[in-house]
Interface confidence: medium
C-alpha cells in the first residue's frame, strides 16, 4: 500500500509522488534507499525533492532504484517507498509492456482516454496524442484538458495511445510521454437463454467402428462479453471426467467466437477408436448461463465403411 512502482524514459521528466497519504502541512524527507543519502531540495539539482514530490528533470537510467519518503507530522512519522525504473528510449515504435499504464475501456457513449500521471506535472494545453505511434488527426479526435475524446468509437479504435506534453519547471521545458491501451467494449451487450446451434436435438451421428469421431457442441448466449456461460458434454447424464472412459475426452478449454456479433462457445468431444458400446451411450450437449440450461441429445449409429453417399 505504501510502496509504489514508477517508471519513465531517459531524458524525459519524471515526477513521483510519495505513496503516503499526506497533508499539505506535513514535511516530507526523501532518501535514496540504497545509500540512505538525503535527496536535496534545491531546484538547481537534476534530481530534487519538493514536498510530496520527487522530481527527475530529466531522468537518467542510473536514477533507477528505491527511494524512501518519510512523512513527518507533529505526532508521528510514516514511511513510504517509491520504486523508480528509468528505461532507455526505444528506437522502434513498439511500446513495451513495462512502460504501459493501466488499460482503459471505452464505448460508443463514453470514450475518454485520460493521460496517465499528468496531474503531477506543470503542463499547458494542448496535449499531443498518438495511436500506435501515429499522430492522431481528424475531427473524430479531440484533445480536451487531460483527456482524449474519440467520437463515434469503433472497434478499430482499440490500441495503444500515447500522450505527449511539456513539463515546465522554472522556465525550463522537459518532454513527458505516457502510454496506455484502450479497449472498446460493446455497450449494447445482452444475454439470453442459451441457443444451441449444433448438434440438432435428437441428432443421429453416423460413425465408423474403429475410427475416431468428433462431436461439436456449439451454443450462443447473447451479445457482448458473457458471464457464467459454459458448454459441456455429458455421457449418460454423467460428466466426461467422471465417466471414466479415457478414449472419450472433451477438448481442453472452450473456444469463444463472435458470430453475427453474438457470443458463442463450442466444445469438441473426441472419441478415439469408436467401439460398439459407444453406440449405446446418450451424448448430451449442455449449454448453460444465468438464464438456465439447454440440452440437446445425440446418439451414434454405425456407418457402413463401404457406404460413401453423403
Amino acid at each position: 500500500k505504501f510502496s509504489k512502482q514508477s517508471w519513465g524514459l531517459e531524458n524525459e521528466a519524471l515526477i513521483v509522488r510519495c505513496p503516503r497519504q499526506g497533508k499539505p502541512s506535513y514535511t516530507v524527507d526523501w532518501y535514496y534507499s540504497q545509500t540512505n543519502k538525503s535527496i536535496p531540495t534545491q531546484e538547481r539539482n537534476r534530481v530534487f525533492a519538493s514536498g510530496q514530490l520527487l522530481k527527475f528533470l530529466p531522468a537518467a537510467v542510473a536514477d533507477s532504484g528505491i527511494y524512501t519518503c518519510i512523512v513527518r507530522s507533529p505526532t508521528f512519522n510514516r514511511t513510504g517507498y517509491a520504486n523508480v525504473t528509468i528505461y532507455k528510449k526505444q528506437s522502434d515504435c513498439n511500446v513495451p509492456d513495462y512502460l504501459m499504464y493501466s488499460t482503459v475501456s471505452g464505448s460508443e457513449k463514453n470514450s475518454k482516454i485520460y493521460c496517465p500521471t499528468i496531474d503531477l506535472y506543470n503542463w499547458t494545453a494542448p496535449l499531443e496524442w498518438f495511436k500506435n505511434c501515429q499522430a492522431l488527426q481528424g475531427s473524430r479526435y479531440r484533445a480536451h484538458k487531460s483527456f482524449l475524446v474519440i467520437d463515434n468509437v469503433m472497434t478499430e479504435d482499440a490500441g495503444d495511445y500515447t500522450c505527449k506534453f511539456i513539463h515546465n519547471e522554472n522556465g525550463a521545458n522537459y518532454s513527458v510521454t505516457a502510454t496506455r491501451s484502450f479497449t472498446v467494449k460493446d455497450e449494447q451487450g445482452f444475454s439470453l437463454f442459451p441457443v444451441i446451434g449444433a448438434p440438432a436435438q435428437n441428432e443421429i451421428k453416423e460413425v465408423e467402428i474403429g475410427k475416431n469421431a468428433n462431436l461439436t457442441c456449439s451454443a450462443c448466449f447473447g451479445k457482448g462479453t458473457q458471464f457464467l456461460a459454459a458448454v459441456l458434454w455429458q455421457l449418460n447424464g454423467t460428466k466426461i471426467t467422471d465417466f471414466g472412459e479415457p478414449r472419450i475426452q472433451q477438448e481442453e478449454g472452450q473456444n469463444q467466437s463472435f458470430s453475427n456479433g453474438l457470443a458463442c462457445l463450442d466444445m469438441v468431444l473426441r472419441i478415439a477408436d469408436v467401439k460398439e458400446e459407444d453406440l449405446l451411450l446418450q451424448y448430451d450437449c449442455l449449454a448453460l448461463n444465468l438464464h438456465g440450461l439447454r440440452r440437446h441429445t445425440v446418439r451414434l449409429s454405425r456407418k457402413n465403411p463401404i457406404d460413401h453417399h453423403s
Epitope: K1, Q21, K23, S25, S73, P74, T75, F76, R78
Partner: antibody, heavy 117, light 106 residues
C-alpha cells in the same frame, strides 16, 4: 508534549444527545486526523469515525452512521463528538485519538458516558 | 465490510515465554494492520503500525509479521509488565478492531 484532554463524565437519559470535547495541545489540530473510539464496559474497542480538521471531511463507521457527528474547531484546537438517540448500550468510555488517516498514535484520557433512565 | 478474527481471546503464559497473537481478515488488506496494547484501567497505546514497524520507545521484544490476510503479534520473551489486552486494527477500508486478546501471567 502532545496531549489530548477530554471533557468530563456525562449521565444521559435514553433518547438524549451527548457532546464530548477533546482539546489538543503541543500541536495544531489541523495537522493530523482525529478519530473517535468507543469502549463499552468490559468490552473491546470500536472505531466510530474520523475527521480531517483542516477541511472538515468526515467518515463514520456503519454502526454509528446517522447518529454520530464529528466536528472540529481549528481556532481552539478542539474536536467534538456528538452521539444522538442514546440507548443503554451506548454506555461506554469514548476516546478521541490523533494520528494519520490509518492509525491512532496519541489518545485522550477517555470520557465515560452513562445512559440510564 | 472487513471482518477481523483475533485469536486467542485470552491466554496465560509464563515470564520468558514466547507469545503469539494472530489476526485473520476476510480479505487481503496489504500491510495496513496495527497492534495496540491496553493495560488495565489505561488508555490504548500503539505498539506496531503497518504490519511490522515498531513505534519509537516500544521494547524490541514486540514484533509484527504477516501480510495479505494473516497477521501475527509476537512477544519474544514475556515480561510481567506485558499483562494487558492486545488489539489488532485494520485500516485498509475504514477501521476495524479485532475482538482483543487478554494476556495474563501464569
Amino acid at each position: 508534549e502532545v496531549q489530548l484532554v477530554q471533557s468530563g463524565a456525562e449521565v444521559k437519559k435514553p433518547g438524549a444527545t451527548v457532546k464530548i470535547s477533546c482539546k489538543v495541545s503541543a500541536f495544531n489540530i489541523k495537522d493530523d486526523y482525529m478519530h473517535w473510539v468507543q469502549q463499552a464496559p468490559g468490552k473491546g474497542l470500536e472505531w466510530m469515525g474520523r475527521i480531517d480538521p483542516a477541511i472538515g471531511n468526515t467518515e463514520y463507521a456503519e454502526k454509528f452512521q446517522g447518529r454520530v457527528t464529528i466536528t472540529a474547531d481549528t481556532s481552539t484546537d478542539t474536536a467534538y463528538m456528538e452521539l444522538s438517540s442514546l440507548r443503554s448500550e451506548d454506555t461506554a468510555v469514548y476516546y478521541c485519538a490523533t494520528g494519520d488517516f490509518y492509525a491512532m498514535d496519541y489518545w485522550g484520557q477517555g470520557t465515560l458516558v452513562t445512559v440510564s433512565s | 465490510d472487513i471482518q477481523m478474527t483475533q485469536s486467542p481471546s485470552s491466554l496465560s503464559a509464563s515470564v520468558g515465554d514466547r507469545v503469539t497473537i494472530t489476526c485473520i481478515t476476510n480479505t487481503d488488506i496489504d500491510d495496513v494492520i496495527h497492534w495496540y496494547q491496553q493495560k488495565p484501567g489505561k488508555v490504548p497505546k500503539l505498539l506496531i503500525y503497518e504490519g511490522n514497524t515498531l513505534r519509537p520507545g516500544v521494547p524490541s521484544r514486540f514484533s509484527g509479521s504477516g501480510s495479505g490476510t494473516d497477521f501475527t503479534l509476537t512477544i519474544s520473551s514475556l515480561q510481567p509488565e506485558d499483562v494487558a489486552t492486545y488489539y489488532c486494527l485494520q485500516s485498509d477500508n475504514m477501521l476495524t478492531f479485532g475482538q482483543g486478546t487478554k494476556l495474563e501471567i501464569k
